[in-house]
Amino acid sequence: IWELKKDVYVVELDWYPDAPGEMVVLTCDTPEEDGITWTLDQSSEVLGSGKTLTIQVKEFGDAGQYTCHKGGEVLSHSLLLLHKKEDGIWSTDILKDQKEPKNKTFLRCEAKNYSGRFTCWWLTTISTDLTFSVKSSRGSSDPQGVTCGAATLSAERVRGDNKEYEYSVECQEDSACPAAEESLPIEVMVDAVHKLKYENYTSSFFIRDIIKPDPPKNLQLKPLKNSRQVEVSWEYPDTWSTPHSYFSLTFCVQVQGKSKREKKDRVFTDKTSATVICRKNASISVRAQDRYYSSSWSEWASVPCS
């Protein structure tokens, strides 16, 4: 058993049929010594008496708010949550496996640049009685500070018969050095509580591996005289790290016909312009990637040829 926050405790349980559970000692936070009784949740049924109470915790019916009383007055509360371990593996019932980039990916994180700011998100089908708390650091043995905000509901989607809820959080490394080579990974830890169930999820990464630039901005076409060719130009996204001479991007320019089956023409360039043939009813799209490190491509920025 360990304390999650004041008066809230997590009991770690091996979860299998007829498991003995854990014996937990509760102490009433009071100078009183006598006439103390204990109840669980809203029940008026008395569980026991005395300043300390030893309880066996082996199912969700044993979790909840334990209250000690004297003469009708509430003295203190202890909320017990359960953390289940089945076959040596902690439960992951609350969050959905996003399966990308690999199985058992519950948290996904992205950064738009090297400033030390990043966003993480996760999915659940649970809509009520759900709380999240996020902590982060760089390294774990001698951790350096990363400050995370509160997790917020960022999207709702309907998937078949189910509703899916996306939560996200923004974090900022306290003393980020954008140009430095990372040697210690960022650690992100999410505590999830659904009703009386506790779970925790972690992710470990280098900022360089989660970089995904915003799409190029100000995408423009300039027809070339007496030609089907156009000059496509664009700019670095505002959110990308500066100076651009050091934090350089490479770009992919794509000409895509109206039909998805039509052959795509692609050009790769380090410049912020390119010359391509603009077919009727086609569109031109440009995306960006870090020039020196193969992290994710940005989403496409697009304009029609017409």
Partner: nanobody, 115 residues
Framework: EMQLVESGGGLVQPGGSLRLSCAAS????????MYWFRQAPGKGHEWVST????????AYADFVKGRFTISRDNAKNTLYLQMNSLKPEDTALYYC????????RGQGTQVTVSS
């Protein structure tokens, strides 16, 4: 009529063991929280242990300190209290009850711990 009958008490030396039984009739113990209490000579009654419904999770008074185990046999409709490492201060009348107030309780079984 709801009835509880305790048995298994007796005289035992310090460090010894006893197993108390509480046979219930007129109701099912598996559907109720069940309690053991005790009353030492010249003292008030004292809660010892509780067993809950469902998986039968348990609770114990501080003085028990791992020495006693409450259990039940639903088929026999009987509640038990296994008492080990008994001390002279465990000498008391032990009784079972269907509720905290003791509105349904047995007559008790005497436990004496003495050398």
């Amino acid at each position: 009529e709801m009835q509880l009958v305790e048995s298994g008490g007796g005289l035992v030396q310090p460090g010894g063991s006893l197993r108390l039984s509480c046979a219930a009739s007129g109701f099912s113990i598996s559907n109720n929280w069940m309690y053991w209490f005790r009353q030492a000579p010249g003292k008030g009654h004292e809660w010892v242990s509780t067993i809950k419904t469902g998986a039968g999770s348990t609770a114990y008074a501080d003085f028990v300190k791992g020495r006693f185990t409450i259990s039940r046999d639903n088929a026999k409709n009987t509640l038990y209290l296994q008492m080990n490492s008994l001390k002279p201060e465990d000498t008391a009348l032990y009784y079972c009850a269907r509720d905290w107030a003791g509105t349904v309780r047995g007559q008790g079984t005497q436990v004496t711990v003495s050398s």
